[in-house]
């Protein structure tokens, strides 16, 4: 166990052109407060993911109003450290998001206003116990200048706060089969403690903040016991002695969330549905009021005046969870065409396209006529990933560069013969029959089935299709 | 700015049937992908049935076979057609679309219908 400890230093415009504006007015003074939130390892998860290692507040700045005419500062900044306990090991690579949120002091209907001002992520490396390290990270144009480590709480020590140590108990040796604990020479590593709450009857470890179970129990700290009355819905080990099947312990067995929070499984391990009021992995973290800010992503914190009465985050659209942290799966509608891929970056959905799509949801087709020409007078016309030619008469081919032999279709018909010519082709029809394809029969009594033909045509006469 | 309405909610019996339609007005915009998500208390809000910006239509693995999601384009309006439904279903109902105003896309909810089954 131990804690992660965040030090802001400064907070306010970064070098160079385009400074922002100042976040706040004399019409709407405002000040500032810091979240951060951590995760084990070096994933590039989404800022909305769970903070599995932990989250914290800051308190509030001081208030701020902007004084006219003058550049933006560096912004007065809440007293103190950010603090996050981890209660298992120290993880060694962790990701971090900070959050720098405003929150407006002006005549706001319903109380104060929050909106993100910048967030900044990263990916680091950090040995438990080591001196403090220091950032500078940028988000548009502002800059953060912040500290961190990483210390265990006694008696855990160690780059990942595994170890145990002990005062020694004699001045000139350790326990037996116990050894100094370096670099603390006057102390001994003190023996395994197990996980907080594991049975002492029905559990031991191997490791520490290890609870494992004693044949017949089962759950997280080996408090439930194993039903024999049915074997028969197998699942896990056989039981010695019963002989029959037992249920082996899943991740919710014995509900690991506190405070009345629901367990669910998921693929990797549970998730905890907190009860308003509490959040945190396990729903550890409670006796936070309105004032704290617990609504992330512009939610609206409703009620929660003081520790002992519950608030309530309305969250705005596309947020949920008890404290607006989860964004919905919006990419889960499939809007990218093309088989492009979807990426929901909070403020927008994107398309990352296949090759030859384009567009902001990869709805252009690069292949088609872009860049393509039909020769001969050909018209290009777009479908289905490749471009193809509507040839004008007279030619054809993919490209329309081949000399088309318009008479090889036979379109003339009842027994006409048909003619090449530049502009098309030409039916001379057989008798009793007109038309431009030879297609309607002249009647016995001279008169044809449509409007008589054109001045100066008999029927029979050949005739041009243009 | 464009308004998804929803309608159609209300309580019904297990094995009973609803249908629900979105209406999307606005001025001078397209729809790319238009579907209903579902909250259930304390849940996550999840896609339902959908057509995908492809046209395709999507389902929950949950509602394959019970569910069939419509739209009429003439009215710029979809359907769920809900059949067979569960205690399992009840949640709020939730209309979203990806929508093309002028020549940017921005994404769109309904303020969502109830849905409630119970004996």
């Known amino acids: 166990a131990g804690v992660f400890e965040l030090q802001i230093h400064s907070f306010g415009p970064g070098p160079g052109p385009g400074a922002p504006r100042s976040p706040c007015s004399a019409r709407l003074p405002c000040r500032l407060f810091f979240r951060v939130c951590l995760k084990p390892g070096l994933s590039e998860e989404a800022a909305e993911s769970p903070c599995a290692l932990g989250a914290a507040l800051s308190a509030r700045g001081p208030v701020y109003t902007e004084q006219p005419g003058a550049p933006a500062p560096d912004l007065p900044l809440p007293d103190g450290l950010l603090q996050v306990p981890f209660r298992d090991a120290w993880p060694g690579t962790f990701s971090f998001i900070i959050e720098t949120w405003r929150e407006e002091l002006g005549d706001q209907i319903g109380g104060p206003a929050w909106s993100l001002l910048a967030r900044v992520a990263g990916r680091r490396r950090l040995a438990a116990g080591g001196p403090w390290a220091r950032d500078i990270q940028r988000a548009g144009a502002w800059e953060l200048r912040f500290s961190y480590r990483a210390r265990c709480e006694p008696p855990a020590v160690g780059t990942a706060c595994t170890r145990l140590c002990r005062p020694r108990s004699a001045p000139s040796r350790c326990g037996p089969g116990l050894r100094p604990c370096a670099p603390l020479e006057d102390e001994c590593e003190a023996p395994l403690v197990c996980r907080a709450g594991c049975s002492p009857e029905h559990g031991f470890c191997e490791q520490p903040g290890e609870c494992r179970c004693l044949e017949g129990w089962t759950g997280p700290l080996c408090t439930v016991p194993v039903s024999t009355s049915s074997c028969l819905s197998p699942r896990g080990p056989s039981s010695a002695t019963t002989g029959c099947l037992v249920p082996g312990p899943g991740p919710c067995d014995g509900n690991p969330c506190a405070n009345g929070g629901s367990c669910s499984e998921t693929p990797r391990s549970f998730e905890c549905t907190c009860p308003r009021g509490f959040y945190g992995l396990r729903c550890e973290v409670s006796g936070v009021t309105c004032a704290d800010g617990p609504c992330f992503n512009g939610g609206l914190c409703v009620g929660g005046a003081d520790p002992d009465s519950a608030y309530i985050c309305h969250c705005p659209p596309g947020f949920q969870g008890s404290n607006c942290e989860k964004r919905v799966d919006r990419c889960s509608l499939q809007p990218c065409r093309n088989g492009g891929l979807c990426l929901d970056l909070g403020h927008a959905l994107r398309c990352r396209c296949r090759a030859g799509f384009a567009g902001p949801r990869c709805e252009h087709d690069l292949d088609d006529c872009a860049g393509r020409a039909c020769a001969n007078g050909g018209t290009c016309v777009e479908g289905g990933g490749a471009h193809r030619c509507s040839c004008a008469l007279g030619f054809g081919g993919r490209d329309c560069r081949e000399r088309a032999d318009p008479c090889a279709a036979r379109p003339c018909a009842h027994g006409g013969r048909c003619y090449a010519h530049f502009s098309g082709l030409v039916c001379a029809c057989a008798p009793g029959y007109m038309g431009a394809r030879c297609e309607f029969p002249v009647h016995p009594d001279g008169a044809s089935a449509l409007p008589a033909a054109p001045p100066g045509l008999r029927p029979g006469d050949p005739q041009r299709y243009l | 700015e464009v308004q998804l309405v929803e309608s159609g909610g209300g309580e019904v019996q297990p094995g009973g049937s609803l249908r629900l339609s979105c209406a999307a007005s606005?001025?001078?915009?397209?729809?790319?992908?238009i579907g209903w998500y579902r909250q259930a208390p304390g849940k996550q809000r999840d896609l339902v049935a959908g057509?995908?910006?492809?046209?395709?239509?999507t389902y929950a693995e949950s509602v394959k076979g019970r569910f069939t999601i419509s739209r009429d384009n003439a009215k710029n309006t979809v359907y769920l057609q809900m059949s067979s439904l569960r205690a399992e279903d009840t949640a709020v109902y939730y209309c979203?679309?990806?929508?093309?105003?002028?020549?940017?896309?921005?994404?769109?909810w309904g303020q969502g219908t109830l849905v409630t089954v119970k004996p």
């Open positions: 057509f995908t910006g492809d046209g395709v239509t």
């Open positions: 606005g001025s001078d915009f397209s729809i790319n992908a």
């Open positions: 979203a679309a990806d929508v093309k105003i002028g020549g940017d896309y921005e994404w769109f």
